[in-house]
């Protein structure tokens, strides 16, 4: 799913207020809902009929520093016999997410939002024929 | 996938520098990679063997204001005959993501990061027995 463009209005002050100085805003320290509970089924990446592997990318100047990307293992899907069925397709499920980029020059540190496209997992789909008149 | 805790070090200045005043940081306006392309297969939510619906949540004081949640349609998976096969399980694929929360009192506007758990889609898995000795 795609994050809509900011349109540069979300981060602006109301029109009746003085503009933000120097093109930056105040970001409070701390994260809301930092301890929220994730209860996802176990090992779904290997149990799925469209299984996937994970690759971890690491960047110390990004929050979160660790971003995990999924890659589908097969073109087709795994059938009840454990064999690949190429009459079905394994396809990635993608999600746009926000990360925070840290930029520093000496003791001057600033942050900027960045969009990252994450492949979260894969799903098995029936092929579709489109475009043909 | 779960976002690790901040540990409150990412947003700190180097130790040799004066601390951040007032518990806030400088967030630059604009978003890196704002125009990046999402190229996901068409209609995978209805073509999947573990199909899902989308629900849109809207909050004008959140960026992105629109967060889309997937919800699996079935307990089981859809077989080649289009019938539900309850010997297999449709399970949600979830991803922790960051959003930005806007807080304002009059002309004073600040922002804070917030973790949100997003269900991105569903996948079909084989049942697994665990724990049992």
């Amino acid at each position: 799913r795609k994050i809509p463009k900011v349109g540069h209005t979300f981060f602006q002050k109301p029109e009746s207020c003085p503009p933000v100085p120097g093109g930056s805003m105040k970001l409070d320290i701390g994260i809301i809902n930092e301890n929220q509970r994730v209860s996802m089924s176990r090992n779904i990446e290997s149990r799925s009929t469209s299984p996937w592997n994970y690759t971890v990318t690491w960047d110390p100047n990004r929050y979160p520093s660790e971003v995990v990307q999924a890659q589908c293992r097969n073109l087709g899907c795994i059938n009840a016999q454990g064999k690949e069925d190429i009459s079905m397709n394994s396809v990635p499920i993608q999600q746009e997410t926000l990360v925070v980029r840290r930029k520093h020059q000496g003791c001057s540190v600033s942050f900027q939002l960045e969009k990252v496209l994450v492949t979260v997992g894969c799903t098995c789909v029936t092929p579709v024929i489109h475009h043909v008149q | 996938r779960k976002i690790p805790k901040v540990g409150h070090t990412f947003f700190q200045k180097p130790e040799s520098c004066p601390p951040v005043p007032g518990g806030s940081m400088k967030l630059d306006i604009g978003i890196i990679n704002e125009n990046q392309r999402v190229s996901m297969s068409r209609n995978i939510e209805s073509r999947s063997t573990s199909p899902w619906n989308y629900t849109v949540t809207w909050d004008p004081n959140r960026y992105p204001s629109e967060v889309v949640q997937a919800q699996c349609r079935n307990l089981g998976c859809i077989n080649a005959q289009g019938k539900e096969d309850i010997s297999m399980n449709s399970v949600p694929i979830q991803q922790e993501t960051l959003v930005v929360r806007r807080k304002h009192q009059g002309c004073s506007v600040s922002f804070q990061l917030e973790k949100v758990l997003v269900t991105v889609g569903c996948t079909c898995v084989t049942p697994v027995i665990h724990h049992v000795q």
Epitope: S39, S41 | A70, L75, S90, V91, P92, T119, H130, H131
Partner: nanobody, 128 residues
Framework: EVQLVESGGGLVQAGGSLRLSCAAS????????IGWFRQAPGKEREGVSC????????FYADSVKGRFTVSADNAKNTVYLQMNSLEPEDTAVYFC?????????????????????WGQGTQVTVSS
């Protein structure tokens, strides 16, 4: 082997009550959460109730809230579904299942999902 056996179904008049039992073997309720589901003729299986022994949490589908109650007897390794104020729309085969995941906020088809094993089911018929 993980096994579940339901009992207690039958024919009852609208407004009546039944208590279904789900006897588990091959595991304890610490290993899995328990879901109650039902399937009416020509319809897909749907969630009715969830139970987790770890903290006693329960969850009910909107259609049965206030009428159905789930409970457990850990000594007997049995989960019960007490069904009151039964309606003709409650007619279905009722199944219990051992499930891996119980998450009320989940965007699964029901709050308990990822079934490990189904019971064989017990028929409940509510006449008007």
């Amino acid at each position: 082997e993980v096994q579940l056996v339901e009992s207690g179904g039958g024919l009852v008049q609208a407004g009546g009550s039944l208590r279904l039992s789900c006897a588990a073997s091959g595991f304890t309720f610490d290993d899995y959460d328990i879901g109650w589901f039902r399937q009416a003729p020509g319809k897909e299986r749907e969630g009715v109730s969830c139970f987790t022994s770890s903290d006693g949490r329960t969850f009910y589908a909107d259609s049965v809230k206030g009428r159905f109650t789930v409970s457990a007897d850990n000594a007997k390794n049995t989960v019960y579904l007490q069904m009151n104020s039964l309606e003709p729309e409650d007619t279905a085969v009722y199944f219990c299942a051992a499930v891996n995941t119980f998450d009320e906020s989940a965007y699964a088809a029901f709050a308990c999902y990822d079934v490990v094993r189904w019971g064989q089911g017990t028929q409940v018929t509510v006449s008007s």
